[in-house]
Amino acid sequence: QEEDLPRPSISAEPGTVIPLGSHVTFVCRGPVGVQTFRLERESRSTYNDTEDVSQASPSESEARFRIDSVSEGNAGPYRCIYYKPPKWSEQSDYLELLVKETSGGPDSPDTEPGSSAGPTQRPSDNSHNEHAPASQGLKAEHLY
């Protein structure tokens, strides 16, 4: 009998409000044994896959998707889904990335720390991305 897969969580480091030109890393978490994590965007057809999965704790695995230099085009809702053979999980809730112009420079510490979406934030809107596919093992230095 197939196990019931828990929904993934998604968070952003250093936060969800990122100055233009700064970096952000999306962290997707799921159970141990995940083979592939996928990061999707609401109403966008693009996605990123990675098989670079590390163990975050005895019961959790994670993958990190980094955007080196955030632009206005990177703003919007993101969500994670993972593949643990032989099936995919449900999608996480969406996490909204906000990109703001800043006069403080790229190292300005005015991001919101610890932002994440577990099963309590905005519900997944299944109207667009249920049918996504995947690219292999992309490092997120060059996301989108």
Partner: antibody, heavy 116, light 111 residues
């Protein structure tokens, strides 16, 4: 990397027919597969799709007339009770890496003829 | 149901000329959009997706633009080999309306 359709043949109206899309050289679990058909001399017509995450979609005209299912290496299109209007070349296609919107990998097609 | 309206149905242009094909979606479809080229007896070939990214191996004479509900394919410096039928497709609708739909096609004749 390729996809190939099989199962197309001549059948009489009302005879169930199953077409199979077989994936080679890539892991099917990561991809959406769509089925498209083209009647002789006509345009492309979307039938439906099987998504990487296990969802299945159908064009409104195809609901109840076809069933799409997948295994780890194939995606099947079952025509439950075909009519002469279903005579066409049937294609399956896989989307491009990193973007769900474009289907870059197409099979050569398989010809289905429904005739009494 | 999502409907893609493609115009014109046929267009003729001389070698070296420019052809513009338009596609209108009945609802906003985000970036879930692509253009395909098909020649008689062949499978469709992906040209543009997302909706302005050039597919691998496609020359930059082909350009896609648009967003929301209005999309355009422009073929410049037309070559004889460009004679084909071109289709637009969206595959980003919702569960209730079916997420795949093709335009009716545009036959491009090169003189």
């Amino acid at each position: 990397q390729s996809v190939k359709e099989s199962g197309g043949r001549l059948v009489t109206p009302g005879t169930p027919l199953t077409l199979t899309c077989t994936a080679s050289g890539f892991s099917l679990y990561k991809y959406n597969i769509q089925w498209v058909r083209q009647a002789p001399g006509k345009g492309l017509e979307y039938i439906g799709a099987s998504t990487y995450a296990g969802y299945t979609y159908y064009a409104s005209w195809a609901k109840g007339r076809v069933t799409i299912s997948r295994t780890s290496t194939t995606v099947d299109l079952k025509m439950t009770s075909p009519t002469t209007e279903d005579t066409a070349t049937y294609f399956c296609a896989r989307h491009i890496d990193g973007d769900y919107s474009g289907y870059a990998l197409w099979g050569p097609g398989t010809l289905v003829t429904i005739s009494s | 149901e999502l409907v893609m309206t493609q115009t014109p149905a046929s267009v003729s242009a001389a070698v070296g000329g420019t052809v513009t094909i338009k596609c209108q979606a009945s609802q906003s479809i985000g970036t879930w959009f692509a253009w395909y080229q098909q020649k008689p007896g062949q499978s469709p070939k992906l040209l543009i997706y997302g909706p302005s990214k050039l597919a691998s191996g496609v020359p930059p004479r082909f350009k896609g633009s648009g967003s929301g509900t209005e999309f355009t394919l422009t073929i410049s410096d037309l070559e004889c080999d460009d004679a084909a039928t071109y289709y637009c497709q969206s595959n980003g609708g919702s569960i209730s309306n079916g997420w795949g739909s093709f335009g009716g096609g545009t036959e491009v004749v090169v003189k």
